[in-house]
């Protein structure tokens, strides 16, 4: 997956730090105070859909095959720049019953982006 | 994840059968002759306006939080209806060296859809 460098507008990973204080979650998330979540942005022209070596690749390639042929209903289905590889992270937080939970939360950090 | 039933236009899973003959792959894929790949389609309104947040990852929830507030750069970042749970499937096919390979291919079948 590409890292966004400002030079390309093709689907890429953009660095982004989430501050839990900024979104009002700091009184129930004990740790960390924030984290590098990152996000995906950029264009997904038809020729690169499903070619990023992403976790969606076989399915994306198949659907893209139909899409490129103008096959209904895929002709109008837009390929999207989305996370294709995410990483877990450990968090300490209060749950709904005010109990303290330490848990590895899946899919917190975007590692790679690709076209769906 | 929702199943598309024709009544809602919210992000949902649509049944779709892929015929390998249709896409010209039948000369190198020995078995199966096709499979239910399915795909995702539908709108991704702000999380709270959606009918279900149950398949949203933590990352999606956080980014959507910023997006709802019109926070740059997320205000113009579109949330996409994409696979959130995929299933593998076994395939028998010829590799580049014309060897017959039997392999469980990851992420072939879309099981659930959600908003990125």
């Amino acid at each position: 997956g590409l890292e966004c460098d400002g030079k390309v507008n093709i689907c890429c990973k953009k660095q982004f730090f989430v501050s839990f204080k900024d979104i009002g979650w700091n009184d129930w998330i004990i740790a960390p105070s924030g984290y590098h979540a990152n996000y995906c942005e950029g264009e997904c022209p038809s020729h690169i859909a499903g070619t990023s070596g992403s976790s969606l690749s076989f399915h994306s390639t198949v659907i893209n095959h139909y899409r490129m042929r103008g096959h209904s209903p895929f002709a109008n289905l837009k390929s999207c720049c989305v996370p294709t590889k995410l990483r877990p992270m450990s968090m300490l937080y209060y749950d709904d019953g005010q109990n303290i939970i330490k848990k590895d939360i899946q899919n917190m950090i975007v590692e790679e982006c690709g076209c769906s | 994840g929702l199943e598309c039933d024709g009544k809602v236009n919210i992000c949902c899973k649509k049944q779709f059968f892929v015929s390998f003959k249709d896409i010209g792959w039948n000369d190198w894929i020995i078995a199966p002759s096709g499979y239910h790949a399915n795909y995702c389609e539908g709108e991704c309104p702000s999380h709270i306006a959606g009918t279900s947040g149950s398949s949203l990852s933590f990352h999606s929830t956080v980014i959507n939080h910023y997006r709802m507030r019109g926070h740059s750069p997320f205000a113009n970042l579109k949330s996409c209806c994409v696979p959130t749970k995929l299933r593998p499937m076994s395939m028998l096919y010829y590799d580049d060296g014309q060897n017959i390979i039997k392999k469980d291919i990851q992420n072939m079948i879309v099981e659930e859809c959600g908003c990125s």
Partner: antibody, heavy 123, light 107 residues
């Protein structure tokens, strides 16, 4: 400690409007959603809708769509629920409750409730 | 919308006995279900969340079980202060929906 304090009882005529307030304290207001739930005397609980205190985004129960408006004032940590075109069957105790909505953490239960506001609709 | 059906509507139990309340969902809500206790003139109080987790300060005699579509709230040995109405709510989907309630009364 967390508190949701609601405005006092109201008596309204059919066709009028009512605006109930819910003042939050003891937590970061914008970190939670505010849900509104009503209860006709002697009956069960009915979900009316929700507002994100962070963004102001709303989701209303279908049967109340067009008659209900939920708003927040983050400067005073107060949520409001306005119900218009009141009918006699709107006579109920109206509750606000806070919740998070983060499926990935299994969060979504209403953990704190206001004391309730009785709205009586009578000619 | 997801319909929650509670049974029985009324449960007559003697103090010290066990009470078993049921909540059935019209479709799977995973473990996104909570139980509330409500006494006359009071707001509901959270007892169980995540189908089986007890909220802070709730006595151990209250327990929840189930996932998907079938859920149970058990009060192992009823105390006088437990006679009340109990509601389940699902928070898997919008709209949020409540069960019709079970009234636990003294036999």
């Amino acid at each position: 400690q967390v508190q949701l304090v609601q405005s006092g009882a109201e008596v309204k005529k059919p066709g009028a409007s009512v605006k109930v307030s819910c003042k939050a304290s003891g937590y970061t207001f914008t970190g939670y959603h505010i849900h509104w739930v009503r209860q006709v005397p002697g009956q069960g609980l009915e979900w009316m809708g929700v507002i994100s205190a962070y963004s102001g985004d709303t989701n209303y129960a279908q049967k109340l769509q067009g008659r209900v408006t939920m708003t927040t004032d983050t400067s005073t940590s107060t949520a409001y629920m306005e119900l218009r075109s009141l009918r006699s069957d709107d006579t109920a105790v109206y509750y606000c409750a806070r919740a998070r909505d983060i499926a990935a953490l299994g969060l979504g239960a209403f953990d704190y409730w206001g004391q309730g506001t009785l709205v009586t609709v009578s000619s | 919308e997801i319909v929650l059906t509670q049974s029985p509507a009324t449960l007559s139990v003697s103090p010290g006995e066990r009470a078993t309340l049921s909540c059935r969902a019209s479709q799977s809500v995973s473990s996104n279900l909570a139980w509330y206790q409500q006494k006359p003139g009071q707001a509901p109080r959270l007892l169980i969340y995540g189908a089986s987790d007890r909220a802070t300060g709730i006595p151990a005699r209250f327990s929840g079980s189930g996932s998907g579509t079938e859920f149970t709230l058990t009060i192992s040995s009823l105390q006088s202060e437990d006679f009340a109405v109990y509601y389940c709510i699902q928070y898997s989907n919008y709209p949020r929906t409540f069960g019709g309630g079970t009234k636990v009364e003294i036999k």
